[in-house]
Structure formats: structure tokens, C-alpha cells
Interface confidence: medium
Amino acid sequence: RGVFRRDAHKSEVAHRFKDLGEENFKALVLIAFAQYLQQCPFEDHVKLVNEVTEFAKTCVADESAENCDKSLHTLFGDKLCTVATLRETYGEMADCCAKQEPERNECFLQHKDDNPNLPRLVRPEVDVMCTAFHDNEETFLKKYLYEIARRHPYFYAPELLFFAKRYKAAFTECCQAADKAACLLPKLDELRDEGKASSAKQRLKCASLQKFGERAFKAWAVARLSQRFPKAEFAEVSKLVTDLTKVHTECCHGDLLECADDRADLAKYICENQDSISSKLKECCEKPLLEKSHCIAEVENDEMPADLPSLAADFVESKDVCKNYAEAKDVFLGMFLYEYARRHPDYSVVLLLRLAKTYETTLEKCCAAADPHECYAKVFDEFKPLVEEPQNLIKQNCELFEQLGEYKFQNALLVRYTKKVPQVSTPTLVEVSRNLGKVGSKCCKHPEAKRMPCAEDYLSVVLNQLCVLHEKTPVSDRVTKCCTESLVNRRPCFSALEVDETYVPKEFNAETFTFHADICTLSEKERQIKKQTALVELVKHKPKATKEQLKAVMDDFAAFVEKCCKADDKETCFAEEGKKLVAASQAALGL
């Protein structure tokens, strides 16, 4: 099986239908279509999925039937191109339909929109949701897949099936509970938060593959799997990396049926070979398929083997370093990364990749030098500052987080990042800075040994959100530079940015700082976002404002909202007190 399976099947669509089963087949085709055509109504997608499913069944019955030998891209692309409103709804994406495969699929991929113009998902009343769930469970769950997939066009499809299974379980349990809301809402909140995190993590994997190539993704995978499975042999880790790369390449490329099928195969292989991979897999491997795959992906690091020899022996002291490097560069560097990562679960993956890059650069130079050994003898000394930089950064920021709490820590980051890249849109700065700020509550609680992998790898995910959002409408050369030059140095690149002295402050617009009584009915989170939006705008108007000035204005603003939300005539209060606040803020900031 594996890479060569395709040759053995006359009909790819029949093969995948049989492998996956009808339910998963339909769900994955729906996800694929929704991720490509993000604006199409639900009913249109369901119709297309049903047509594809009926066709797949004819191919299962007779693999030689007409068109059954066509590739999945051809079949799915032809189906998408039958959508009548393609030109009106998607504009130039309709031009993709004039192309042949594989160019047509590449064209569809390029038109995936990370920030589609879709209304925010508003959660109906619990009773309304439970009624809809009971009336038509299948449609209800399909709608969930559709709404998530169209808003997250790179969501890891087999994992979305796992989320849908949990979503269904939550409704099955809670719609029978005495207090439906108390049972259901926390579960839905958890699924929403986990879903956003899962989407962002997968988006980084796809960006890594698409923008930096397979080699970059494989390097990431070697480091991560070596940390997770330190007892596994290098050959075993290499095999897992190859298979995992294939799975993610397929999912990121829109080949969702192949991806889900190959992910299932990989989970099966891992469980069949867990003795040579990790002692932590036992529980995962007893679970059903979707839970099993999810569990393996999240499994804790195995214990490091005792008495691992010093790395210096093979990678610095050996007289065969240059010989080994020359004979198979990527294998030798892969071994270095494997050996370093399995010894350092306390390092972030991106740090390990920076160390490997430093080692590679040193060998590239020294193995062509007069005296190679003398040249690379002190290479490990070059690692020290690379290790200390994130350690110090995390220490400082965790201290700041503990001192300020999450909301104010987010505000500090909002100010910091707005000053670095003030050209970026306010909603993007708010979203990204809020997520950056969550690193505090997510990671600072951990002991020293777990802080860096938690924090820096999480920051890589969040900064990738900034990069993909910025790529859609580029406005800052500094963001472009940090996003495109090096995947592993994105965080240090952004950290090193100082205040953008070239930025011309935004004209003051009183409308931006005009608030209404509707703010009083918002949830605490939404109210925070409103205040943080105002903070970003303030910094854009007055980039040289001091922390103290901004704090004073924000404190006044919080008091103003609190006061007016308690007033009898809220709207009048917001109008009158708002004018005073704007005037006072202008004076305080010298606008």
C-alpha cells in the first residue's frame, strides 16, 4: 500500500469510497467542496456531494463504467465547474475552469481565502439547536462541517470529522439533559476554541509545505517526532516523517479522500509498531479510528532513553563528519536533528531547526575549508546564544503576563505590534495580538522544561496567521520580509522589529472613538475587543505615545463605558460623555 496503491485500482473514486465508507466519503467531499467554493449556499454543496456519491456508487458496482477511471481532481473539478453562478460569485476563480488538470486544481487552491467575507457564526438558542438536531441530525451535522470548512479552507479534514463526531456526541448527550444549556454551552465553547487552534496549527503546516517546500516540512516533522518518540530509531522516525509528509501534502493540496485514507493507514502502522515507536501509545491505540488518530497526534513525549552518548562524538569530534555530510547531506543533517531533538524535549521545534540550520551552514563552510575540524570544532558554542534568546524572551514575557494578567498583557502586545507594523489592518492586529497574548495563560503555567516548546511553537502558529492574512492584502514590507525570509526565524524577526519610524500617523477621526449603548449588551470578550480596537487606533494616531499616556486614556475609556452602561439614558451618556472623553484623550496624547 502507501505511495504505490493508486496503480492497483482501475477506479480511484471507487477505491476511496470502499476504503472510507459512504458516511466519511460524503463528509470529506462536502469539506473539500466547501473549502474550494466558500461562498456557495449549503444546499448547492449538498446537491453536488449527492451527485458525486451516486457516481461513486456506480463505480463501486462497475469499476470499468464510463468516467470511473478519471482522477479525483478531474471528477471533483468538473463538478465544481458546473456551478452556474461561478463567475458572478467568485470572479476570476471561474477562469480556473478553462484550465486542464493539474493546473485547474492548483488554480482552485490559489483562490482559497483565509479571511472570507462571511457573516460571523451566531449561536442560536439551545432549544432551537436541539430541535434542529432532533429534526434532522444528518443535515444538522453536515451544516456544521460546511460552516467550519468554508471559514477554514485549510482545516485538517480527517480531524474535522473527529470534531463533528464530538459535536454530535455533545448534542446527543445534552439535548436530553435537565439543564441543556449548562451541559451544551461549555462543550461548544471548548470545541470552538479547540477548532480554532486546530485550524491555525494546520494552516502553519500547509504554509510550510506550500511556501517553503517539502524539505522544510520534513525537517519540522523530524524534530517534532524525535522529541515525541525519542526511543524510536532514526530509520523509524524517517519512515513516519515520509508518511506524515504525504498525508499533509495531500490534505493541503485538497486531496482529502487520499489524505484521510493515508492518515488511517499511518495510525494503523503506528499502532502495529508501537513497541518500536513509543511506550505512550497504548491508550490511543485502543480507541476507534478518528479518536485514535487524534490521540496519536497529541500524545505526550515518551521518556528519553537513559545514557544517550554525547552528540559531540558523532557530529564534531569524528573525523568522518565532512565525509558523512558530503555523501548524504540531508540524511546526515536529519540524523543531527533527530539526535538533538530526542535529547531536547525542552526546546521548541523552531529552535531545534535553527540549530540544525546553523550546523548545516557551518559544515557547508568548514567542509570546504583548509582544516575542516578546526573550523567546525566550536560549532556547538554558536548554539548558546540561539538557545538563550527564546529562553530570556519567554522569561521576560511570562513575568509580564503574571504581573498584568491576560487582558492587559494582550494590550501590551497590541501596543508593541502596532508600533512595529502600524500599516497592518486594525482587525488583524487585534486578532493576532489577542492570540499572541494567550501564550501567557497557555504556557507560563508550565515548568521551565515545557515552557519553550509550548510558547515558541504556539507563537509560530499565531505569527503564521498574521502572515497568511497579510499575504492576501500586503501593506507592510517589514511583515512580508519576516514572513518570507525564513520560516524558523519568523518569531525572532518580528521580535527584533523596532518602532516603524517611517510610519506617517493616521489622521484623527472622531468616528473611530464614538461608542454606543450596544457595547453594554456585549459579552466580556466582545467588549474587550472593542476596547482593544480603540487602543490600536490610538497607537496608529499617536505612535510615539508612552505606555503611561496610553494607560491613562484606556483607564478613562474603561471608566466611561462602565459609567454609561450603568446610566438610565445610556445612549445620551455615550454621546455626551464620549465627546468629553475624545477631547480629553486628544489633550492627553497631544493630538
Partner: antibody, heavy 119, light 111 residues
């Protein structure tokens, strides 16, 4: 096609300064060492020193340390050999060579620059 | 930093084999196989003919071969031809921090 092109012959007086050049093309200039080699009239070859243009790391043979300066400008893929005060004994043919491979070997050479120092 | 020692000249008739020795290879250079041989015609730039003791760059005739025993490296040219007449220099490393050293060169004459 890998090429190293050196600047033309020079005739100088003792005490004068001089900078000769070696421009690389057809390969990644920043990722290979460049060596300078001296050959005095009727004599053998002598390694003078090497430079890695990627980071300007420079090493000199003991007998040339302090006598010459090796530098590089990676933006124009050019390495240099310079003297601040020439002596008659500096009269020689000077070659640049790209050092390449697992251990350095001069696999491509410039055509040579003849430097004559005479009063 | 002493130069490597080579014979000043060797000669041979067409079709014969000759060997040029190069003594004084440091143990470091020996362990890393850091020995190269260059051919140079009068008025021309040197040309690499052997590197890492025994390896030939592409385009170099297999009549040229290299070997090493102890602290001495050797270049053997079999089936001598008239156009092999040239100066041959070995090169290696003198030790830590040294750039490299050449031997004094050997003039090969084809009789």
C-alpha cells in the same frame, strides 16, 4: 559555467599600494572559499590565505600574515588581495582559486595576475 | 610551517609509469585525506588532477592515480605521454589553523 576572472597585470614601484581582484561567476560565490596563491619567478606555488565570502572569515598562511590583506565583496562576487606597501620581493604571478568539496581543493583557477615591483 | 618535500625532477619514457612522492603529510591531513595534486604547464594556471589522496575530478585521465602510506603521498602516472610533461605539485595541511602548504614541485620530463 564556473569562471574566475582576475584583474590585469600591474607594474608598481616599491612602497606603493595595490589591490588586485578576482571575480567569480557560474556558482554560489558566498558558499565556497577563495584562495590566493603566489608563484614567484621560477619557483613553486605558495598558498597565501583563504576567505569565505559568505561571512568574510579569513585565514592567512603564517608567512603572509600581516603582509597582505584578503577581502571580498559578496554583492559583486569579487575577492581581493591587497598590499599597503609593495616590495621588490612581491614580484610574482598571483592566482585565485575556488576551493571546493568535502575538503578544500582548488578546482577552478583564475588566469593569474602578474605583479611586477621595480624602481 | 615547512613545505612538503618532493623530488625536484623525475623523467620517464613514453608508455612507462612514473611515481612522484610527497613526504611530510601531517597526521591531521592524513586522517582527513587532505592531499591534492596539481599539474601546471609553463605560463598557465595550475589544474587539479587528484584530491582527497585518491580521487580524480571528472575529465582527468585515469592514467593519473594517487595513494598514501604513512606520512607520504604519491602520484603515479601510467602510460606516459609527451603532453604529461609539466610541473606537478602536491598540497596538504600543516596542522591546526594553517591554510595549506604546497610541495616544492616536481618537473616531469618525458624522454
Amino acid at each position: 559555467e564556473v569562471q574566475l576572472v582576475q584583474s590585469g597585470a600591474e607594474v608598481k614601484k616599491p612602497g606603493e599600494s595595490l589591490k588586485i581582484s578576482c571575480k567569480g561567476s557560474g556558482y554560489s560565490f558566498t558558499r565556497s572559499w577563495i584562495a590566493w596563491v603566489r608563484q614567484m619567478p621560477g619557483k613553486g606555488l605558495e598558498w597565501m590565505g583563504i576567505i569565505y565570502p559568505g561571512d568574510s572569515d579569513t585565514r592567512y598562511s603564517p608567512s603572509f600574515e600581516g603582509q597582505v590583506t584578503i577581502s571580498a565583496d559578496k554583492s559583486i562576487s569579487t575577492a581581493y588581495l591587497q598590499w599597503s606597501s609593495l616590495k621588490a620581493s612581491d614580484t610574482a604571478m598571483y592566482y585565485c582559486a575556488r576551493l571546493h568539496g568535502v575538503v578544500s581543493r582548488g578546482d577552478y583557477w583564475g588566469q593569474g595576475t602578474l605583479v611586477t615591483v621595480s624602481s | 610551517q615547512s613545505a612538503l618535500t618532493q623530488p625536484a625532477s623525475v623523467s620517464g619514457s613514453p608508455g612507462q609509469s612514473i611515481t612522484i612522492s610527497c613526504s611530510g603529510i601531517s597526521s591531521l591531513a592524513g586522517s582527513y585525506n587532505l592531499v591534492s595534486w596539481y599539474q601546471q604547464y609553463p605560463g598557465k594556471a595550475p589544474k587539479l588532477i587528484i584530491y582527497e589522496v585518491t580521487k580524480r575530478p571528472s575529465g582527468v585521465s585515469n592514467r593519473f592515480s594517487g595513494s598514501k602510506s604513512g606520512n607520504t603521498a604519491s602520484l603515479t602516472i601510467s602510460g606516459l605521454q609527451a603532453d604529461d610533461e609539466a610541473e606537478y605539485s602536491c598540497s596538504s595541511y600543516a596542522g591546526r589553523n594553517a591554510v595549506a602548504v604546497f610541495g616544492g614541485g616536481t618537473q616531469l620530463t618525458v624522454l
